[in-house]
């Protein structure tokens, strides 16, 4: 039978508002049918929408009645309308896209790392620290020390010595491990993995006990 276009999967078109983090891929679908087979076109905020209108372009998959945008950015926010038509009629559906900018945050350290260790005098020890960060993180391994019998400075901040810092020649894997060789009783104490980026620092600590 000949006839105007109609939606073939209206249940898949219920979600009219789509909010996605920046850099994600977005796909809008308007599965339809009709006789003759209808055409599909897309509008953004009521105007014709073509690939040259956005950096990275768009993918129009007519067989799947879909519009795909990869690596969305805040400027992709807006109302997207599919227009499905043949000579007997026209139908349309509007979706609203919101692009969520990822809020920058301090590095995130994996829970439970580094872990407390007990080692025999003269043995080797490794502390591990797993860091997740959007912005490039810098990692420092710190050893807590005493100064004139005190563990903290005049303002209450703990005294520390830097054991290892991120370097241009240091891989993430190297940084995420602190290796102590041939441990002595002086190596016993508190160790901290400190990760920083432009937002701030995060830190986890662990203790080393050295047995005779």
């Amino acid at each position: 039978d000949t006839g105007a276009p109609y939606w073939t999967r209206p249940e898949r078109m219920d979600k009219k508002l789509l909010a996605v983090p920046a850099a994600n891929t977005v796909r809008f679908r308007c599965p339809a049918a009709g006789n003759p087979t209808p055409s599909i076109s897309w509008l953004k905020n009521g105007r014709e929408f073509r690939g040259e209108h956005r950096i990275g372009g768009i993918k129009l998959r007519h067989q799947q009645w879909s519009l795909v945008m990869e690596s969305v950015v805040p400027s992709d926010r807006g109302n997207y309308t599919c227009v499905v038509e043949n000579k007997f009629g026209s139908i349309r559906q509007t979706y609203t896209l919101d692009v969520l900018e990822r809020s920058p945050h301090r590095p995130i350290l994996q829970a439970g790392l580094p872990a407390n260790q007990t080692a025999v005098l003269g043995s080797d020890v490794e502390f591990h620290c797993k860091v997740y960060s959007d912005a490039q993180p810098h990692i420092q391994w710190l050893k807590h020390v005493e100064v004139n019998g005190s563990k903290v400075g005049p303002d209450g901040t703990p005294y520390v010595t830097v054991l290892k810092t991120a370097g241009a020649n240091t891989t993430d894997k190297e940084l995420e491990v602190l290796s102590l060789h041939n441990v002595t009783f002086e190596d016993a104490g508190e160790y901290t993995c400190l990760a920083g980026n432009s937002i701030g620092f995060s830190h986890h600590s662990a203790w080393l006990v050295v047995l005779p």
Epitope: V162, L194, F201, H203
Partner: antibody
Framework: QVQLVQSGAEVKKPGASVKVSCKAS????????MHWVRQAPGQGLEWMGW????????NYAQKFQGRVTMTRDTSISTAYMELSSLRSEDTAVYYC???????????????????WGQGTLVTVSS | DIALTQPASVSGSPGQSITISCTGT?????????VSWYQQHPGKAPKLMIY???NRPSGVSNRFSGSKSGNTASLTISGLQAEDEADYYC????????FGGGTKLTVLG
């Protein structure tokens, strides 16, 4: 990006005081130490002290004890260095400098200065 | 104040390698890997070139390298270029900052 913007040049009379400001942007001000370093004309770098913007704690070089005061205003991400009882030999460019070390700790060994302000020329002349 | 000792000046021709030394004691340079190097062009603020003896910050040319032997740290600049002409300062952190006296690098020719 990290920026440290200092106040403008000052001319002071001997015996007076000067207060230099340093506005930080591009990072969380309270997370990193701020150091002050000066450089007399044609001379090398001379460390004056640091302030922990998180706690307000300070550590001054022995040479400047009693004459220097370092403060901060976290609401506007700004550090200040005030030097009193000025003499002609205090004529120098004064730099604020961010120290790569978390303000949660007191660094006994290690750490380094990674960003510097543009410098403030203080001239002491009668 | 304790200071680190640097030569007052060094020079080299374009394309050559030069090394600037920074001598301290076993309490600072010798005992720990905490020496930084800064480059300062006339009228400009210092710029971090090397930290923790041999680490290069991102954006610094790999022509700059750092090392340490005993109580002496060294900054080596290979493939010398005209824009390398500047003052260079070493620095160590031990409770407080200690700077070297500075070395003036002249690029000849």
């Amino acid at each position: 990006q990290v920026q440290l913007v200092q106040s403008g040049a000052e001319v002071k009379k001997p015996g007076a005081s000067v207060k230099v400001s340093c506005k930080a942007s591009g990072y969380t001000f309270t997370s990193y130490y701020m150091h002050w370093v000066r450089q007399a004309p044609g001379q090398g770098l001379e460390w004056m002290g640091w302030i922990n913007p998180n706690s307000g704690g300070t550590n001054y070089a022995q040479k400047f004890q009693g004459r220097v005061t370092m403060t901060r205003d976290t609401s506007i991400s700004t550090a200040y260095m005030e030097l009193s009882s000025l003499r002609s030999e205090d004529t120098a460019v004064y730099y604020c400098a961010r120290y790569y070390g978390s303000s949660l700790y007191h660094y006994v060994f290690g750490g380094f200065i990674d960003y510097w302000g543009q410098g403030t020329l203080v001239t002491v002349s009668s | 104040d304790i200071a680190l000792t640097q030569p007052a000046s060094v020079s080299g021709s374009p394309g050559q390698s030069i090394t600037i030394s920074c001598t301290g004691t076993s309490s600072d340079v010798g005992g720990y890997n905490y020496v930084s190097w800064y480059q300062q062009h006339p009228g400009k603020a210092p710029k971090l070139m090397i930290y923790d003896v041999s680490n290069r910050p991102s954006g610094v040319s790999n022509r700059f390298s750092g090392s340490k032997s005993g109580n002496t740290a060294s900054l080596t600049i290979s493939g010398l270029q005209a824009e390398d002409e500047a003052d260079y300062y070493c620095q160590s952190h031990h409770f407080y900052e200690v700077f070297g006296g500075g070395t003036k690098l002249t690029v000849l020719g």
